[in-house]
């Protein structure tokens, strides 16, 4: 049974041309985390692989570092990084557990971070 | 230049180990994995194995764990695949592979291994 | 693991004319898949990485597509020098799997 639940920053804001943290924390289990995936939409960001390290998609690493942690940073922010990123938890026993983020790229100077909060996960088994 | 020089063929018999070299040479040896694909007579490509230089981390595919063993010597550039308790099926071509997020830019040239007794 | 299946085992197209290889992934793999080229008695070679990224040096009558679990790679006009195995690869999660290969062949 899985049990874990992901944290994840929520709903976001950040500036154009700024740079923006994208978190997530897995709790409530015990499954061990061989690999975290960072998505968007349809492409892969990063990979961050227990036993081999990160790696970033060679079409993003120019503006994406990362961490901290398991987190991911995007930098040189645009108004086309708007949309949805997904951090996909693999882990064993358990599968998958996936967190989801909204980003919103905005022109002026009313970013502001949404509060941290959890959300509903989604997951299957491998 | 980007090259990957392996070893030569081997002919070993059942029960034996096998040792596979791949000497890398034209860039930074540390800065990208090396993967270990091999090719049965008339069978699809089979991934086996990674190790990053760098942090010596491996990462083994499950059917494979404790038979094979993934390593790399940094001040050679080389790394270095050994199979253990030979059989039959392990038969196949053997490639090492530069890993650049987990795709395979850059392959040698292939080491024959046959199993026969 | 995630199962890659290639369709068709084998193909033959005339010359200039379009080859399309599928790929299907067993589970979500988002744009994580690559796909080799592979000549009898040489190394497999790039061709294209990250379902869509045309690898350097590669001509541009290669191209690939898809994302999540379906992918596709397509010659636009065959060529003598295109004769070989092709096989698609998961780069998404380990073990990076790889399809069964689809034989391109001359008509």
């Known amino acids: 049974m899985m049990t874990g639940t992901i944290e994840t920053t929520g709903n976001i804001s950040a500036e154009k041309g700024g740079s923006i943290i994208l978190q997530c924390h897995l709790s409530s289990t015990t499954a061990q985390v061989t690999q975290v995936n960072w998505e968007q939409q349809d492409q892969l960001l990063a990979i961050c692989n227990a036993d081999l390290g990160w790696h970033i998609s060679p079409s993003f690493k120019d503006r994406v570092a990362p961490g901290p942690g398991l987190g991911l940073t995007l930098q040189s922010l645009t108004v086309n990084d708007t949309g949805e990123y997904f951090c996909i938890y693999h882990t064993y026993p358990d599968g998958t557990y996936t967190g989801r983020i909204f980003l919103e790229v905005l022109e002026s100077s009313v970013a502001e971070h949404g509060a941290r909060f959890q959300i509903p996960h989604h997951h299957h088994h491998h | 230049e980007v090259q990957l020089v392996q070893s030569g063929a081997e002919v070993k018999k059942p029960g034996a180990s096998v040792k596979v070299s791949c000497k890398a040479s034209?860039?930074?040896?540390?800065?990208?994995?090396i993967e270990w694909v091999r090719q049965a007579p008339g069978q699809r490509l089979e991934w086996m194995g990674v190790?990053?230089?760098?942090?010596?981390?491996?990462n083994y595919k499950e059917k494979f764990k404790g038979r094979v063993t993934i390593t790399a010597d940094k001040s050679s550039s080389t790394a270095y695949m050994e199979l253990s308790s030979l059989r039959s099926e392990d038969t196949a071509v053997y490639y090492c592979?530069?890993?650049?997020?987990?795709?395979?830019?850059?392959w040698g040239q292939g080491t024959t291994v046959t199993v026969s007794s | 693991d995630i199962v890659m299946t290639q369709s068709p085992d084998s193909l033959a197209v005339s010359l200039g004319e379009r080859a399309t290889i599928n790929c299907k992934a067993s589970?979500?793999?988002?744009?994580?898949v690559a796909w080799y080229q592979h000549k009898p008695g040489q190394s497999p070679k790039l061709l294209i990485y990250?379902?869509?990224y045309r690898y350097t040096g590669v001509p541009d009558r290669f191209s690939g597509s898809g994302s999540g679990t379906d992918f596709t790679l397509t010659i636009s006009s065959l060529q003598a020098e295109d004769v070989a195995v092709y096989y698609c690869?998961?780069?998404?999660?380990?073990?990076?799997?790889f399809g069964g290969g689809t034989k391109v062949e001359i008509k």
């Open positions: 990250s379902a869509s």
């Open positions: 034209g860039y930074a040896f540390t800065n990208y994995l």
């Open positions: 589970q979500h793999v988002s744009n994580g």
């Open positions: 190790i990053n230089p760098g942090s010596g981390g491996t």
């Open positions: 592979a530069r890993g650049e997020y987990f795709f395979f830019d850059y």
């Open positions: 690869q998961q780069h998404y999660n380990t073990p990076h799997t």
